[in-house]
């Protein structure tokens, strides 16, 4: 709140704006008649220091020169850069209760002279765009500092214009309003920036540029594609581009992909035809344009095109399987199952499969359409059958794909030998075999089959399976296989006319079972205790279980249990034991046991056999 | 319609300054440039500046450059040339010329591409 100076004046020395690192003298006097009332030798001058409107410092030590009860000069040094204040202030001594009086204040600005400016960089967006042009300006100068950019060209002509830094805006950038026209473009424009302040000026060294280097083309628009004869492969792509591009550049890749394909195309003039799209498959499109072959800049990418190419017919060949059920003496239920086709074979949306089952020699065909990947019939037990199916989309049908229907394992001698399956990781399972050791006739091929066992795991889901060449003897099987779940996998050996297989259970991850199975029921028959019970219930048995231990000891007893460990068969709920002591009461119970470990026990039955036993 | 109206031109010893101004009426400069041309006795119309009006840019014949300015006024419509350090060949008739977009640097020179013309003002400098 500084007066408007009625008491004096205050001036500094060299100037109000001085280099950092420099001293200033200010001096503070007061005008005629003004000043404590009594006597002038009471008049005391005090300087005060304001940095952001805090008073930082009495600058009383620092006073230089002083006229008593007139003026006085302080010297100020170690300023720091920017704006700090100094009040000059009036106390009269004698009065202890009154507060100095403002005198009079000065703002003295601390900064540095400006660097030259560099990096000039100028740009045109477009053929009808304008010349703007940037710059680094180096340090910071702490003081208002006028820029100057000056572009001088052809026709004697100069354009300037100016623009300023301070504490609040940032001059870096400025727009010279005007257009460089394709007529100039063998012109060359020199372009330099100027900057001053009260602590100096400087100037950039002049850069030198032509129309060609910095003319951006805008990027392409009004892009579209139009497939020829609604082919899924061909498509001419168009777009709208300026007068002076000379080269195009066009990246396109389908929409999941992660690398483009690239083309160039010299005088192209908004059209180019490819011949390499995949049908059926979103696509997006971009294009770049330059003004000349060998200088200029490329323009900013056009906004993508996306669009899906057309459809066209299936391609490849569908992965199919059966399974085959006797109903009855006579008759026999083929259930066939397929893959879906991958997008790049099926090459549109499949509408439906053309499904045939064909006797050989009685020329029977039973023929059907299905949008499922799954078809079942009865068909008689007798005959060789062929099975066929081929997918349709809008455009046609893939060529069929045949299996003959055989007594999958029906022929000992293909059995594959020695199978096992191993856990690889919480999601496969690595199954390795032998061929079989005195097949027939050469095996063409194996299928490695499997399904989770649980109940109504055969009629409810599908079986998946992998083909595998005949010269290969392990498969690792990922598809819908999940930790803690027992598989049944089966390894068939297929040959022309006959199949054999082989069959064991595994799993990708195991724990032991959450707890043992329930004993029902216990039954004395000859001599002999059939053990009961249920099995497991399926979401607790955490893997595939190796064997069920049958444990039992007297009551009341401390002794160790005795105990019979029974091979695990998904069919067996019971089970003989013939060591127990007649008219002795024994507790039994059960565990189960996977390759992790052993579960606790089960439900406690007491048992008091009658008869007698070996 | 724009109307221009050239001011400020007179008799001036050699060595001396004149302001020029140039006002307009019927609309703004908003987004033209703005000329100062130039025809001596005998001889063809002669470019001296401009200002692009929108972007604050100044255009300058290179030898004119550093005695002659041209600035403007918002409030006023108006723009002005300030001439220093002038010489009996600087005697003419001063014109200002409006012209609008597209503003290309071929253009900015040329006299048929500006639209709106005053009336002129003389200047005379006495040697």
């Known amino acids: 709140n500084i007066d408007v100076c009625k008491l004096g004046t205050v001036t500094v020395q060299p100037a109000p704006v001085i280099p950092l690192g420099s001293a200033a003298n200010i001096s503070c006097s007061l005008n005629p008649k003004q000043g404590c009332s009594h006597y002038p030798s009471s008049n005391e001058l005090i300087l005060l220091k304001f940095v952001n409107d805090v008073l930082v410092e009495n600058l009383h030590g620092k006073k230089v020169h002083d006229h008593t009860g007139h003026s006085s000069t302080f010297q100020v040094t170690n300023l720091s850069l920017g704006m700090t204040l100094f009040v000059c202030k009036l106390n009269c001594s004698n009065s202890q209760k009154k507060p100095p009086v403002p005198v009079c204040g000065v703002e003295i600005s601390v900064g540095v002279a400006p660097e030259p400016p560099q990096n000039i960089s100028c740009v045109q967006e477009g053929e009808n765009g304008t010349v703007a042009c940037s710059w680094n300006s180096g340090k910071v100068t702490y003081l208002k500092t006028n820029y100057t950019l000056q572009l001088s060209g052809p026709n004697n002509l100069t354009c300037q214009k100016q623009c300023f830094s301070d504490n609040r805006q940032n001059c870096n950038r400025l727009d010279l309003g005007i257009n460089l026209s394709p007529d100039l473009a063998e012109s060359r424009f020199i372009v330099r920036v100027t900057a001053i302040n009260d602590l100096g000026n400087s100037s950039s060294l002049p850069h030198t540029f032509t129309f060609l280097d910095i003319v951006i083309p805008l990027p392409p628009w009004d892009i579209r594609i139009n497939f020829l004869n609604a082919s899924g492969s061909r498509g001419t792509l168009q777009w709208e581009d300026e007068g002076q591009v000379v080269l195009n550049q066009l990246r396109y890749q389908p929409l999941n992909s992660t690398s483009w394909n690239m083309v160039n195309a010299t005088n192209a003039k908004g059209k180019y035809d490819l011949r390499d799209l995949r049908p059926f498959t979103e696509y997006e499109f971009q294009i770049s344009s330059k003004l000349h072959l060998s200088g200029g800049s490329w323009s900013n990418w056009s906004e993508s095109l996306r669009t899906r190419t057309p459809e066209e017919e299936p391609v490849g060949i569908l992965d199919i399987w059966y399974m085959k059920q006797d109903i009855d003496y006579d008759r026999q239920q083929i259930s066939l199952f397929w893959k879906s086709l991958n997008p790049s074979e099926a090459r549109g949306k499949i509408l439906h499969y053309q499904v045939t089952l064909q006797e050989v020699t009685k020329k029977t065909t039973l023929q059907n359409t299905t949008r499922h990947t799954s078809w079942t019939r009865v068909i008689p037990r007798t005959g060789a059958w062929t099975a066929s199916v081929s997918a349709a989309n809008s455009k046609g049908a893939s060529a069929p794909t045949h299996i003959n229907i055989v007594d999958l394992c029906g022929t000992g001698l293909l059995a594959p030998h020695q199978v096992s399956a191993k856990s690889e990781n919480m999601d496969n399972i690595l199954v390795t075999w032998q061929p079989p050791k005195k097949a027939d006739s050469a095996v063409r091929e194996y299928i490695v089959e499997w399904r989770a066992l649980q109940p109504g795991s055969i009629t409810k889901f599908p079986p998946h399976w992998l083909r595998i060449p005949p010269d290969n003897m392990s498969a690792l099987i990922s598809e819908n296989i999940k930790p803690y779940i027992c598989y049944e996998i089966r390894v068939h050996a297929l040959s022309e006319s006959q199949g054999g297989c082989s069959s064991i259970r595994g799993d990708s991850k195991h724990k032991a079972p959450v707890s043992g199975p329930h004993i029902t029921a216990i039954t004395e028959k000859k001599e002999r205790l059939f053990i009961s019970w249920t099995h497991i219930p399926f979401p607790e048995q955490r893997g595939c279980i190796l064997h069920y231990r049958i444990y039992w000891k007297e009551r009341d007893s401390t002794a160790q249990p005795e105990l019979c460990e029974i091979q695990y068969r998904r069919s067996q709920n019971s089970h003989p034991i013939s060591s127990l002591q007649p008219r002795v009461t024994y507790v039994l119970w059960m565990t189960a046991v996977t390759a992790a470990g052993e579960s606790p026990q089960g439900n406690e039955r007491e048992f008091c056999p009658q008869g007698k036993a070996n | 319609q724009v109307q221009l109206q050239e001011s400020g031109g007179g008799l001036v010893q050699a060595g001396g300054s004149l302001r020029l101004s140039c006002a307009a009426s019927g609309r703004t400069f908003s987004n033209s440039v703005i000329g100062w041309f130039r025809q001596a006795p005998g001889k063809e119309r002669e470019f001296v500046a401009a200002?692009?009006?929108?972007?604050?840019?100044?255009f300058y014949v290179d030898s004119f450059k550093g005695r002659f300015s041209i600035s403007r006024d918002n409030a006023k419509n108006t723009v002005y040339l300030q001439m220093n350090s002038l010489k009996p060949e600087d005697t003419a008739v001063y014109y200002c010329?409006?012209?609008?977009?597209?503003?290309?640097?071929?253009?900015?020179?040329?006299?048929?591409?500006?639209?709106?013309w005053g009336q002129g003002t003389q200047v005379t400098v006495s040697s």
């Open positions: 200002l692009s009006w929108s972007a604050g840019s100044e």
């Open positions: 010329a409006a012209k609008n977009p597209p503003h290309r640097w071929s253009d900015i020179g040329k006299s048929p591409q500006y639209a709106y």
